[in-house]
């Protein structure tokens, strides 16, 4: 089901925002040994005019912010996106239960952008 | 005023949509020359649960839908972001006047992926 | 040819709610937004919010945030507007009208006369 | 939100003769997105001219638009009996869209 803002207005300007994920809230506790969890983040918020420095909007998000300013039915807002990602090393079992420590690119949100 | 999607089971899948921007639709015709305008196309749709190959979606993004899903209140679907972004050529008048040649980076939306 | 047709009049007590619809014919319904508008005696014409037909997205007007609801029945190619605690200023006619990327309102519906009174 | 205020309230002229009436917008259209509809009575509003100036395919070429930034202008030449009507500005250059107030052209 759907889970919106209904007052687009309330919400704040995109940004990074902290999350620690545990491994056994999702689940993935009997494959992976260590870490218990890491901080993950996400990115939330509004990329709405005008698109101020800190939102790292590259030159089609501003474009399509103007189009969406004018058309809203028919083109969204750029949405806020993560722009610098880090990797994390898991030590897992495998599917023959050897112990493998693996580095996972693209897991940590370091910076958000409006893309 | 709010600009939400009420029927999100309804939305597609995360997608790259055809969009034609004419820079005199823009209001920038007195100082962009050439081109007319350009296919910048947009990236909308939907970044549920599972997450398929034809989403390109990162780790992070596989971690935060899964995340969502749990906690939908307080976590938000990664969202539908561009993955591929080309650049264009435009003629266009400086402040003083000159006629300019200059490439754009990121006008264009190539691909799409949940991020 | 595109056509708007609208419910016909209704007249209502204050407080209580009307549900006006719009069915579309003669374009492709999923990829219009469709608007409503309503012109109350003596006032200028106000814009009331839209609906993607395809998409479900919709806007309202600041004004009308709390109180009005558009929807759509993609089956019934119909959009509908509910507009709740209804008082007498709501006294009105109600249009419908479709909306194209980059441009105004170019189809609308004969409009619909809401009467609200005790 | 963009106001937009039309005069004259009336104009009385008569068939043959050309009639011209203003929208003002409180800030600058950019892009010049305004629009001009004709409302007779009973009827629901037609649109006439967009982009200012560009006229809609089958409106007579007796209508016709001008202006930019915050002044537009519709002119209509050699009134018939069926331009006596109400007519209406709409900016439509995203939420919310406004309309001016209207102008009524009537028979004198």
């Known amino acids: 089901s759907a889970s919106d803002y209904n007052s687009s207005e309330l919400k704040t300007a995109c940004r990074k925002h902290e999350l620690y994920v545990s491994f056994q809230d999702l689940g993935w506790q009997d494959w992976i040994i260590a870490p218990k969890g890491y901080a993950a983040n996400y990115c939330d918020g509004e990329c709405s005019f005008p698109l101020n420095a800190h939102m790292n909007a590259t030159n089609h998000a501003i474009v399509q912010t103007l189009v969406h300013l004018m058309n809203p039915e028919y083109v969204p807002k750029p949405c806020c996106a993560p722009t610098k990602l880090n990797a994390i090393s898991v030590l897992y079992f495998d599917d023959n239960s050897n112990v493998i420590l693996k580095k996972y690119r693209n897991m940590v949100v370091r910076a958000c952008g409006c893309h | 005023s709010a600009s939400d999607y009420n029927s999100s089971e309804l939305k597609t899948a995360c997608r790259k949509h055809e969009l034609y921007v004419s820079f005199q639709d823009l209001g920038w015709q007195d100082w962009i020359i050439a081109p007319k305008g350009y296919a910048a196309n947009y990236c909308d749709g939907e970044c549920s649960f599972p997450l398929n190959a034809h989403m390109n979606a990162t780790n992070h993004a596989i971690v935060q839908t899964l995340v969502h899903l749990m906690n939908p209140e307080y976590v938000p679907k990664p969202c539908c972001a561009p993955t591929k972004l080309n650049a264009i050529s435009v003629l266009y008048f400086d402040d003083n006047s000159n006629v300019i040649l200059k490439k754009y980076r990121n006008m264009v939306v190539r691909a799409c992926g949940c991020h | 040819q595109v056509q708007l047709v609208q419910s016909g009049a209704e007249v209502k007590k204050p407080g209580a709610s009307v549900k006006v619809s719009c069915k579309a014919s003669?374009?492709?319904?999923?990829?219009?937004?469709l608007h409503w508008v309503r012109q109350a005696p003596g006032q200028r014409l106000e814009w009331m919010g839209w609906?993607?037909?395809?998409?479900?997205?919709?806007e309202y007007a600041q004004k009308f945030q709390d109180r009005v609801t558009i929807s759509r029945d993609i089956s019934a190619i119909t959009v509908y507007m509910e507009l709740s605690s209804l008082r007498s200023e709501d006294t009105a006619v109600y249009y419908c009208?479709?909306?194209?990327?980059?441009?105004?309102?170019?189809?609308w519906g004969q409009g619909t006369l809401v009467t609200v009174s005790s | 939100e963009i106001v937009l205020t039309q005069s004259p309230d009336t104009l009385s002229l008569s068939p043959g003769e050309t009639a011209s009436f203003s929208c003002r917008a409180g800030?600058?259209?950019?892009?010049?997105?305004l629009a001009w509809y004709q409302r007779r009575p009973g009827q629901a509003p037609r649109l006439l001219i967009y982009?200012?100036?560009n006229r809609v395919t089958g409106i007579p070429d007796r209508f016709s638009g001008s202006g930019s930034g915050t002044d537009f202008t519709l002119t209509i030449n050699r009134l018939e009996p069926e331009d006596f009507a109400v007519y209406y500005c709409?900016?439509?250059?995203?939420?919310?869209?406004?309309f001016g107030q209207g102008t009524k052209v009537e028979i004198k």
């Open positions: 709409q900016h439509y250059g995203g939420s919310p869209w406004t």
């Open positions: 003669g374009y492709s319904f999923t990829n219009y937004a």
């Open positions: 009208a479709r909306r194209q990327l980059w441009l105004p309102f170019d189809y």
């Open positions: 982009g200012a100036s």
């Open positions: 609906i993607h037909a395809g998409n479900g997205k919709t």
């Open positions: 800030q600058i259209i950019i892009n010049r997105q």
